[in-house]
Each structure stands twice: as structure tokens, then as C-alpha cells.
């Protein structure tokens, strides 16, 4: 699987999950989040050659098409597969509020 | 929706479904398929700017991150959303066999 275990410990050139830290204030303009100040969101990057973690029948076909037509602009793309939630704390007036934000952290990628 | 109805009738520069015809023999090397000879597979292409058909909470965050960090390599990617099946006919000896290949035709795209 193209997950953090494999990708963070290798020098994989193809589609893999990469490290990305997002600072809520600086990178998103969200000044009101109290905790955390930011988080390891990660991102997916890398080419999707034929047979590399292909998602659907269509992505297999497209990768094969790409192999036969190397100059074509039609190619599978490296995108998130498994996503995890992130808990945040913010204040509503003086009252702290905890919220679980779904689909915030990329754990693995796929070629789609 | 970034579907064939919208995308094929517009000159949309951003993420949208594009027309692509795949010839089984020429483009994939699949000589054994009797019918059809090829099919309109389509593909997804175009940038994913802020707010453009974003798929998950993560893709919204990434698009926003990209807006604050325009030079970053982390950005959502235009990939298939709705896929449709394709019926094919091939021969096993003299006997024709009909099969429904799932997820073969792109009907719409999303930024993931």
C-alpha cells in the first residue's frame, strides 16, 4: 500500500503519500482554531505508471492507454485513498468546543 | 456537476471531463475483443482552483493551502467521479461471450 509506513521510509518516485505540515493561521487564514496550531495533512504526489496502485478498471485502461500513447494528456493521477479525521478545539466566547473534522489527514494514496 | 452534459458543451479550462476515444486494438493492444472495436472512455483534465468541485474536507483544505502557497506542489487533482460500465463481446473458441466491464466510462470528474 502507498501509505505513510512505506512512503515516508522510501525514496519512491512514483505516486506516494508525502509529508506536508499545514499551519492553520499561516497557510489557511484560520486564526480562530485554538488547538492544534497546525497538523500533518500530507499530500499525494508522483507519476502513475502502468500497474502502479491503480484504483479502478478505468484507471488500468488509462494507464495502458498512456503506455501506448506516451505523449497523451490523459493519464491517471495520484490522489488520496485513506483519509483520517482531526480533532480541533476552538472557543465560542469563553466556552471551549471540541470538533472532529472528518477526512483531514492523508494516510495513503492511489492512482485514479 | 462536472459531467459530460456540462463539460462537452463548454470551453471549461478547469477540471472537467474531456472526450477520449480508445481503440482496443491500437491503444491497448487488446486484439481479442470482438465488439465494440473501441469506446468513448473520456478522461479528466484541468486545474483544481479554490472551490472548484472539491471532493472532501481534505481537498478543500489543500485548495485553500494552494491559494496561500501558489508555488506549492501539493494541489488537488482532477480525477473521475462517476464511472459507467461497458458491455463487450469476445469469443471463447466459437462461442460468443458477453461481459459487462465495470467502471470503464468517465461521466463526471471531481477535484480530489
Amino acid at each position: 500500500a502507498l501509505d505513510t509506513n512505506y512512503c515516508f521510509s522510501s525514496t519512491e518516485k512514483n505516486c506516494c503519500v508525502r509529508q506536508l505540515y499545514i499551519d492553520f493561521r499561516k497557510d489557511l487564514g484560520w486564526k480562530w482554531i485554538h488547538e492544534p496550531k497546525g497538523y500533518h495533512a500530507n499530500f499525494c504526489l508522483g507519476p502513475c505508471p502502468y500497474i502502479w496502485s491503480l484504483d479502478t478498471q478505468y484507471s488500468k485502461v488509462l494507464a495502458l492507454y498512456n503506455q501506448h500513447n506516451p505523449g497523451a494528456s490523459a493519464a491517471p493521477c495520484c490522489v488520496p485513498q485513506a483519509l483520517e479525521p482531526l480533532p480541533i478545539v476552538y472557543y465560542v466566547g469563553r466556552k471551549p468546543k471540541v470538533e472532529q473534522l472528518s477526512n483531514m489527514i492523508v494516510r495513503s494514496c492511489k492512482c485514479s | 456537476a462536472l459531467d459530460t452534459n456540462y463539460c462537452f458543451s463548454s470551453t471549461e479550462k478547469n477540471c472537467c471531463v474531456r472526450q477520449l476515444y480508445i481503440d482496443f486494438r491500437k491503444d491497448l493492444g487488446w486484439k481479442w475483443i470482438h465488439e465494440p472495436k473501441g469506446y468513448h472512455a473520456n478522461f479528466c483534465l484541468g486545474p483544481c482552483p479554490y472551490i472548484w468541485s472539491l471532493d472532501t474536507q481534505y481537498s478543500k483544505v489543500l485548495a485553500l493551502y494552494n491559494q496561500h502557497n501558489p508555488g506549492a506542489s501539493a494541489a488537488p487533482c482532477c480525477v473521475p467521479q462517476a464511472l459507467e460500465p461497458l458491455p463487450i463481446v469476445y469469443y471463447v473458441g466459437r462461442k460468443p461471450k458477453v461481459e459487462q466491464l465495470s467502471n470503464m466510462i468517465v461521466r463526471s470528474c471531481k477535484c480530489s
Epitope: 487564514g29 486564526k31 466566547g93 469563553r94 | 479554490y50
Partner: antibody, heavy 121, light 107 residues
Amino acid sequence: EVQLVQSGAEVKKPGASVKVSCKTSGYTFMTYWMNWVRQAPGAGLDWMGQIFPAWGSTNYNEMFEGRVTLTADTSTSTAYMELSSLRAGDIAVYYCARGYGNYALDAMDYWGQGTLVTVSS
Amino acid sequence: DIVMTQTPPSLSVSPRETASISCRASESVDSYGNSFMHWYLQKPGQSPQLLIYLASNLESGVSDRFSGSGSGTDFTLRISRVEANDTGVYYCQQNDEDPLSFGQGTK
């Protein structure tokens, strides 16, 4: 230029619901909280609640809780306020107003033009 | 809930004079070194506009004839060299406690 453009005036029957829209432009919709404030004829301002458009988190004034629903569509940068079980006391101008950005509850630096809701049988 | 009380309810001022409006909160609106008190002006037939942020910070684009002061429970908005264009209803607002609340207005 930041703009908040609200939908037109509405006339509703008692017991019905009304949905007011607030189409925004000129700023990043997913970065700021959107508040809704109402003003009865000749009266002051009442805060109804707020929504964070990026993921739809809401905070409501208990005075309206259960009757008001705030939603947002990030694809069109539009916020919505729906008020149900309308009664004569709900006759007011309803405003959407952007939060200043430093806190969830905050000052409001840009306001829509207001939408008059009339309740009449 | 924090109740905001404005005085006077209405005020008539001659041009070039100074006007003062008071706002008293039913409990302190100070937290983390800030006073969570803001001032707005609603001109006739218009939406409210923010004048002062966090008790004393002038909102961008607002005339420096407007100034705010105070902390804890007592706050004041001053308008120096009053102009006819300053006519309207002035509101104070706190956001230190949920629910956010406004004063009843000073005309």
C-alpha cells in the same frame, strides 16, 4: 471588493418556513465565519447564529435553536438561513454578516443588504 | 447571557460638537488581555457598519473622528467634530460570551 448579496423580500404564512440566501464574492468564503442577525421593525439587533462554511460547523443562539438551520455551499460561496414555524414575531429584516476572522464569535466587518421577511395570513 | 445597556437612548448633537455614547455590560467582557467590545453605526435605510473593533481599534476606512475606550464592563464611543452624515443608530456588541449580544442602540 467584498460583497454579500442577499435574496429578495419574502412573504410567508404562519407556520411556514423561509430560506434566505447570501451570495458572497471578493474574499475567500471558506476562511471566515458567516453570522446571521435579525432586526425587527424599529428594534435592535439579535444574533441568530453562525456557520463556518469550510465544513459546516454551526453555533446557534438558544433563542432560535430548533427553528433556525444554517447551511453553506462552498461551490457557489453562498450561505443560507432557514427559519421554520414562522410566526408574527419573526417579521424582521434578516442580515448575513461576515465574522472579522480572529475568533469564532467576533465582530462583523461586512454585512449583506438585508432581507425583509413578512409573516401574514 | 451578557446584557448590554446603552445610554443615552437618543442624542441630538450640533455639527462640530463632540458626542459620547456609553455601553455597560452586565459582566466583564475582558479576556486574554482583550476587551471583546465593538461599535457599529446603522445609517437610515442601511445595514450596520463596523466602526471600532476590540474596544479601541478603528476599523479601516472609518474616519478618525470616531474613537473607542473602556475595559471590563464600561465602554464609551466618542465622535468628535460631528457631521450630519454621522446620523443613525449606534450599537455596541460583545463577543466574550455565547450568545453574542448587542446593545439596544443609541439614536
